[in-house]
């Protein structure tokens, strides 16, 4: 058993090297130390993140993909260790960086924030959706009145530079909008967004942000609502929101105000109708919202509300499309 | 109708040069990325390079880095393949192909044949 | 990087048959898997995306089907203008394609 060897010597990995491969994304590679006897055991490798978040795990692999914020540098160590049923042998660490960026942390954006909506395609796709995404921030408090923001992101492989912004009083860039892009919340692929700046005063310094498309991804209405008064009856009736998910993968909530006492009647529906018995001297507004349910994907937030209908008294039964 | 038509291609020596142009017409050419896939004689498809609508971002397949270089000229709807340090590996058809991101290639232009060779 | 095997290598089907062709794909590519056709001397066609969508003009004897990483390409009714190389595609991390079926008639 070569742990309880006393003379084993587990040696430190080499050439361990930190590569920035994409927006908020390392490589961290490293060679087996070629002067380790018994090459031909099971050797793995302890890896730490010390810097911007710690972290640690095991591999076997010489390489890993680390996707982390890179605006405050970043930092790991490696080492070799051997494990058995009851011990486990450790190198000592090798370690390396990534400087952090240059520029003084109040010249950075604050406050970013993204959503994602599902919109109709506008050309020639292959697919009848797509998704487009809108981001604001706030202008580093330290920024110089010159500054300009610049907004990337980044989907797995594929990294997109903003061409729409809009503007503050000084023309300086405080949201973007691509009206489409290559996001999806299949997987669990992260989003990643960075803003650089640049001033003629001063190093600007820049901002990464990861977000989980699931919890950017703002549902929309549902679509098509109708509401119709049969004696004491109010029949509501809807479509799926405009998304690539099918019918079955939605949950709608449904708020039914009456507007004399002030009385609110939520229910929660997997069906995409509801009858509500009603008097008949109130005038009621009503609304519904979408989520996306398992097994369809993660459960997400509630989506915005549909367009109120009024209905009731000294309002015609009437059926109104939104 | 969509349509790609990519340059004449030809015999190169090893270690020389060549470009390769595709022009796009049929489609509003800056709204779709554009790629390059080869196929090697009486082998299988092999992707080679993308680029973003406006050229900003492109992406290689490891094996070309370094030595290929696509861009595109959006105003003259053309697709460019820059091949640079040619070996005997880069011998194949050259497609031009249309996509969108993470999409398939929906339409693909009728190849140009390279080979590299002494 | 992705990892797409294709199966089998080649195939003989006689007219009317039903042919499967199978793709298997080195870690779950989510369904942004195509099928493409090749006939001799030309480039390849776009049959099936996103693992089951049929494209544009493409006759409903194809189909796809899958999830995760294992799919394929069903052809009922194998006709003679069907006799071609047939490729899958992942599209979920860069582009890479299967190493082809060969397709011939008995």
């Known amino acids: 058993d070569l742990l309880n060897h006393k003379k084993f010597l587990l040696l430190p990995p080499v050439n361990f090297t930190i590569k920035a491969t994409g927006l908020a994304q390392v490589l961290l590679h490293w060679d087996p130390n070629p002067d380790q006897e018994q090459r031909h055991v099971d050797l793995e490798y302890h890896v730490k993140i010390n810097a911007p978040q710690e972290d640690e795990y095991d591999t076997r692999k010489t390489e890993s993909k680390c996707v982390t914020p890179l605006h405050e540098g970043f930092a790991a160590s490696v080492r070799t260790i051997l494990k058995s049923s009851h011990t486990t042998l450790a190198s000592s660490w090798v370690s390396a960086e990534l400087k952090a960026p240059p520029g003084s942390p109040g010249t950075s954006v604050t406050n970013l924030t993204c959503t994602t909506h599902t919109v109709v395609s506008s050309h020639t796709h292959l697919r009848p959706y797509q998704v487009s995404l809108r981001c604001t921030w706030l202008v580093g408090k330290d920024a110089p009145e010159d500054t300009q923001y610049f907004l990337y992101y980044r989907f797995g492989v594929l990294t997109e530079k903003c061409q729409e912004y809009s503007r503050d009083a000084l023309n300086r860039n405080t949201a973007c909008w691509f009206p489409r892009t290559f996001i999806n919340s299949k997987g669990f692929e992260q989003l990643a967004v960075h803003i650089n700046g640049s001033s003629k005063r001063a190093a600007i310094k820049p901002f990464d942000q990861l977000f989980s498309p699931l919890a950017i991804d703002q549902v929309n209405p549902p679509r098509n609502v109708t509401v119709e008064i049969e004696s004491n009856s109010l029949y509501i009736q809807w479509e799926k929101p405009l998304s690539a998910f099918p019918d079955h993968c939605f949950n709608y909530e449904l708020k039914i105000y009456n507007t004399k006492n002030g009385h609110i009647q939520k229910e929660k529906l997997i069906a995409n109708k509801f009858i509500s018995k009603i008097d008949d001297v109130s005038t009621y507004s009503i609304q519904v919202r979408a989520a996306v349910s398992s097994p369809c994907r993660m459960p997400g937030r509630w989506g915005e509300w549909s367009q109120p209908i009024y209905v009731g008294k000294e309002r015609k039964s009437l059926v109104e499309w939104h | 109708e969509v349509q790609l038509v990519e340059s004449d291609g030809g015999l190169v020596q090893p270690g020389r040069s060549l470009k390769l142009s595709c022009a796009a017409s049929?489609?509003?050419?800056?709204?779709?990325?554009m790629a390059w896939v080869r196929q090697a004689p009486t082998k299988g498809l092999e992707w080679v390079a993308t680029i973003s609508y406006d050229g900003s971002s492109a992406y290689y397949r490891d094996s070309v880095k370094g030595r290929f270089t696509i861009s595109r000229d959006n105003a003259k709807s053309t697709l460019y393949l820059q091949m640079d340090s040619l070996s005997s590996e880069d011998t194949a058809t050259y497609y031009c192909?249309?996509?969108?991101?993470?999409?398939?290639?929906?339409?693909w232009g009728q190849g140009v044949m390279v080979t590299v060779s002494s | 990087d992705i990892r797409m095997t294709q199966s089998p290598a080649s195939l003989s089907a006689s007219l009317g048959e039903t042919v499967n062709i199978e793709c298997l794909a080195s870690?779950?590519?989510?369904?942004?898997l195509a099928w493409y056709q090749q006939k001799p001397g030309k480039s390849p066609q776009l049959l099936i995306y996103?693992?089951?969508s049929l494209q544009n003009g493409v006759p409903s004897r194809f189909s796809g089907s899958g999830s995760g990483t294992q799919y394929s390409l069903k052809i009922n009714s194998l006709q003679s203008e069907d006799v071609a190389t047939y490729f899958c595609?992942?599209?979920?991390?860069?582009?890479?394609f299967g190493g082809g079926t060969k397709l011939e008639l008995k």
């Open positions: 192909a249309r996509h969108d991101g993470y999409y398939p290639f929906d339409y």
């Open positions: 870690e779950d590519i989510y369904s942004d």
């Open positions: 996103d693992a089951n």
């Open positions: 049929g489609f509003t050419f800056s709204d779709f990325y």
């Open positions: 595609q992942q599209y979920n991390n860069y582009w890479t």
